[in-house]
């Protein structure tokens, strides 16, 4: 039960985290105009990974995409790449973890397979979270560097804008969303890895049960050969003596009185 809860919680936390990473990547407010030196501005600038925006006090907002690819700073490209890799890995991790969930039964999937899938998705979530945290941290570092270097006609890291002295940029909401989301994805991944350990029981216990079963459960019916192995009718066409993990509905069931003459 604890394993199922840990796995389920890990999945939900990772899902929220990945949704946050996607949101952060799409957000325009990665960097926002620092109003410390100019609190009376009637024009507010903010920038994202994909476009820069200007909000006027009139309420009108104008956004322009970075339509160049080669003209963008390498750091910005690197941040984009990290965030996209994080999203892709997270999405694949979510897909894998859905099939790995203990509460979902798919065909004849064994616990060993579910354990492996849980571990795989957990690792993917961890890497996804680390990618997001790294991406956001690289961007934050870039902002800090540019903040102190913000002088007239300096080519800054946001879409190749020429800055004037007054305009400095500080951390935007997307950075905090990204950090939190990356952290949640990371935590979710760790939880999945912990759940994986609980899903894969020690093999020796199962082997002992298997040998015990094979020695005592052969029954005979009048007019036939070996009628039962003591593990039910094996309707799922599973290998019985595989020495591996079994799902809860495959626990050993000894022959009932109806199996005897």
């Amino acid at each position: 039960m604890a394993v199922t809860a840990c796995q389920g919680l890990g999945f939900v936390v990772s899902l929220i985290g990945i949704a946050g990473i996607i949101a952060a990547t799409c957000m325009d407010q990665w960097s926002t105009q620092d109003l410390y030196n100019n609190p009376v501005t009637a024009v507010f600038n903010y920038q994202g990974l994909w476009r820069s925006c200007v909000r006027e006090s009139s309420g009108f907002t104008e956004c322009r995409g970075y339509f160049t690819l080669l003209g963008l700073p390498a750091m910005l490209q690197a941040v984009r790449a990290l965030m996209i890799v994080g999203i892709v890995l997270g999405a694949i991790g979510l897909l894998v973890s859905i099939f790995a969930l203990k509460c979902i039964r798919i065909g004849s999937m064994e616990d060993s397979a579910k354990a492996n899938m849980t571990l795989t998705s957990g690792i993917m979530f961890i890497v996804s979270g680390l990618c997001a945290i790294a991406g956001v941290s690289v961007f934050a570092n870039m902002l800090v560097t540019n903040f102190w270097m913000s002088t007239a006609n300096m080519y800054t890291g946001m879409g190749g804008m020429v800055q004037t002295v007054q305009t400095r940029y500080t951390f935007g909401a997307a950075l905090f969303v990204g950090w939190v989301a990356g952290g949640l994805t990371l935590i979710g991944g760790v939880m999945m890895c912990i759940a994986c350990r609980g899903l894969a029981p020690e093999e020796t216990n199962y082997k002992a049960v298997s040998y015990h079963a094979s020695g005592h459960s052969v029954a005979y019916k009048p007019g036939g050969f070996k009628a039962s192995t003591g593990f039910g009718s094996n309707t799922k066409n599973k290998k019985i003596y595989d020495g591996g993990a079994r799902t809860e509905d495959e626990v050993q069931s000894y022959p009932s009185k109806h199996d005897y003459v």
């Epitope: 501005t41 006027e56 804008m161 004037t164």
Partner: antibody, heavy 118, light 113 residues
Framework: EVQLQQSGPELVKPGASVKMSCKAS????????MHWVKQKPGQGLEWIGY????????RYNEKFKGKATLTSDKSSSTAYMELSSLTSEDSAVYYC???????????WGQGTSVTVSS | DIVMTQSPSSLTVTAGEKVTMSCKSS????????????LTWYQQKPGQPPKLLIY???TRESGVPDRFTGSGSGTDFTLTISSVQAEDLAVYYC?????????FGSGTKLEIK
């Protein structure tokens, strides 16, 4: 058609208060910020402040803080400006104006003339 | 506060003539985010409220005749009337739209001979 209809002229005594109105029509009142501008006879224009009818947020020129109070009523699409402790210096025409792209004032009311005289 | 200085304070021209008037701001009105200058020009005819002519320093408001042209960047701006008409008799104001408080120039009065 966008229209800003301002209240009629006011003749008030020094020390008194006056509240003028600006009724907006022809557009979504809460979608545009409303600014107020003062013009003394034969002189230039002076920005007083603005009110955002959507949020009721206001901003004032430091010079008019304590003098002007901006309010709005969404239900009647009307903006108000109250001037307190009036002196002869407050005798002027007061305009309400809608703000547009580039923070430019694209539509203006016809103005409310305030005369402070004993 | 940003100080707006207009020159000349008045000028008298004949119809059909080209007119230029200047507006200088004490600080740059250029916004780096969109490379636009937050300067607006208004025309005020006697007994009327001001009328918007030009915003973003050079964008003509719809319905404004194309003889009116705004130019300049940073701190120096110009309004040009390519061929003055009798109905252009008015006072022209420039305004800082970049930071609060919004400030207006003292105006340039255009008179027709």
């Amino acid at each position: 058609e966008v229209q800003l209809q301002q209240s009629g002229p006011e003749l008030v005594k020094p020390g008194a208060s006056v509240k003028m109105s600006c009724k907006a029509s022809g557009y979504a009142f809460t979608s545009y910020v409303m600014h107020w501008v003062k013009q003394k006879p034969g002189q230039g224009l002076e920005w007083i402040g603005y009110i955002n009818p959507y949020s009721d947020g206001t901003r004032y020129n430091e010079k008019f803080k304590g003098k002007a109070t901006l309010t709005s009523d969404k239900s009647s699409s009307t903006a108000y400006m109250e001037l307190s402790s009036l002196t002869s210096e407050d005798s002027a025409v007061y305009y309400c104006t809608r703000i547009y792209y580039g923070n430019a004032m694209d539509y203006w009311g016809q103005g409310t003339s305030v005369t402070v005289s004993s | 506060d940003i100080v707006m200085t207009q020159s000349p304070s008045s000028l008298t021209v004949t119809a059909g003539e080209k007119v230029t008037m200047s507006c200088k701001s004490s600080q740059s009105l250029l916004n780096s985010g969109n490379q636009k200058n937050y300067l607006t020009w208004y025309q005020q005819k006697p007994g009327q409220p001001p009328k918007l002519l030009i915003y973003w320093a050079s964008t003509r408001e719809s319905g404004v005749p194309d003889r009116f042209t705004g130019s300049g960047s940073g701190t120096d701006f110009t309004l040009t009337i390519s061929s003055v008409q009798a109905e252009d008799l008015a006072v022209y104001y420039c305004q800082n739209d970049y930071s609060y408080p919004f400030t207006f120039g003292s105006g340039t009065k255009l008179e027709i001979k």
